[in-house]
């Protein structure tokens, strides 16, 4: 079976998880994209998408989960605010591709998030500051239910809006930091 | 349409193990997760475990390590939980339940009609 | 796990008046997306279950809108805003924030 490596961020309650996966530009690049929560047993679940199709540069807030879908760099940026001890678990970026298994972007993320407020961030360029602006207007999203027949509409939760905002631009003139771990077998 | 058809009711000795299957048709098997859920007679509800019918990758509660088996086979699009070491409190109707795998939701949709198993000397 | 308290253990209602159950989590069922994992059922006599509501809020397919769900964190409530005859039988509370999932008692809801 394959063996899936993970990479480990340890944050503190109040920080934000920011992670980047990158992914093959050409083929994906509008592709519908999502936030998994890896649960017992490999059971991933999916707590937050992009549209479909994905949207260059436009935020879609699903409560305290943040996506943003850079066709130019071919990236997925993940945040996650105001982190909570109860978020500590392993994540992943998945592609969606009906009718096909979603594809997932490198490694897993393992995510650690301990009590206590650190007023400086740590060393970890993934870590901010316990105050956190979530950008006010941003775009939800709803994940497909795959070839249900009894497809159920999901009311979004209440903190979501409809416009996007500048709030959110972040810098990618430097991309280097994506980290790529091969799977190993 | 949708739906989940489980095994007959069986009837096994204390020591023993049971079988039940629970055979899906109407979606895309390997689209969702199934779960086992029993319920005791004048009972309530108790989760027993969790498959991916895509890659057969299982969780089980605590409860029943070590005495449960989920398994699957995607070719005749059926899942299967195997209960050993029977004893007289396993008697219950066991129910499987699907979950769909890619949404948001956890929630059990779509619910088989139930096998009821009696442990009994 | 997370322990589900669910009240009253009987309701005794009369067609046409609302009915209410409650269900308590000992652990916040919010994720982070925002979500609520409480999912609402209802099992009539002698049948499986049935989902009615999940997510907290969310109608399931078919579910008259007689049926709605609340509540946030710990604190989940299922209203019945007029009950028919067609509604008697247990209702479970469920909660999907974690494994294992673990289900409230049930409430019992028949006619007077």
């Known amino acids: 079976a394959t063996k899936l490596t993970e990479e480990k961020y340890e944050l503190k309650e109040g920080q934000t998880l920011d992670v980047k996966c990158d992914y093959t530009l050409e083929k994906f690049a509008s592709s519908q994209k999502a936030w998994q929560i890896i649960r017992d047993g490999e059971m991933p679940k999916t707590l937050a998408c992009t549209e479909r199709p994905s949207k260059n540069s436009h935020p879609v807030q699903v409560g305290r989960i943040i996506l943003e879908d850079y066709h130019d760099h071919g990236l997925l940026r993940v945040r996650m605010v105001n982190l909570q001890v109860e978020d500590s678990g392993l994540y992943q970026c998945v592609i969606y591709q009906p009718p096909k298994e979603p594809h997932m972007l490198f490694d897993r993320i393992r995510l650690v998030v301990t009590k206590g407020f650190s007023g400086t961030p740590g060393s970890n360029e993934n870590s901010t500051q316990n105050v956190y602006k979530i950008p006010p207007t941003t775009t939800k999203a709803l994940c497909p239910l795959y070839t249900s027949p009894r497809t159920v509409t999901q009311a979004p939760p209440k903190s979501t809006a409809d416009v996007s905002t500048p709030d959110s631009e972040i810098n990618l003139t430097n991309v280097t930091d994506i980290i790529r771990v091969p799977v190993f077998n | 349409q949708v739906q989940l058809v489980q095994s007959g009711a069986e009837v096994k000795k204390p020591g023993a193990s049971v079988k039940v299957s629970c055979k899906a048709s109407g979606y895309t098997f390997t689209s969702y997760y199934m779960h086992w859920v029993r319920q005791a007679p004048g009972q309530g509800l108790e989760w027993m475990g969790i498959i991916n019918p895509s890659g057969g990758s299982t969780s089980y509660a605590q409860k029943f390590q070590g005495r449960v088996t989920m398994t699957r086979d995607t070719s005749t699009s059926t899942v299967y939980m195997e209960l050993s070491s029977l004893r007289s409190e396993d008697t219950a109707v066991y129910y499987c339940a699907r979950e769909a795998g890619y949404d948001i939701s956890s929630a059990f949709d779509i619910w088989g009609q139930g096998t009821m198993v009696t442990v009994s000397s | 796990d997370i322990v589900m308290t669910q009240s009253p253990l009987s309701l005794p209602v009369t067609p046409g008046e609302p009915a209410s159950i409650s269900c308590r989590s000992s652990q916040s069922l919010l994720h982070s997306n925002g979500y609520n994992y409480l999912d609402w059922y209802l099992q009539k006599p002698g049948q499986s279950p049935q989902l009615l509501i999940y997510?907290?809020?969310n109608r399931a397919s078919g579910v008259p809108d007689r049926f709605s769900g609340s509540g946030s964190g710990t604190d989940f409530t299922l209203k019945i805003s007029r009950v028919e005859a067609e509604d008697v039988g247990v209702y479970y509370c469920m909660q999907a924030r974690q494994a294992p999932w673990t289900f409230g008692g049930g409430t019992k809801v028949e006619i007077k």
């Open positions: 997510l907290g809020s």
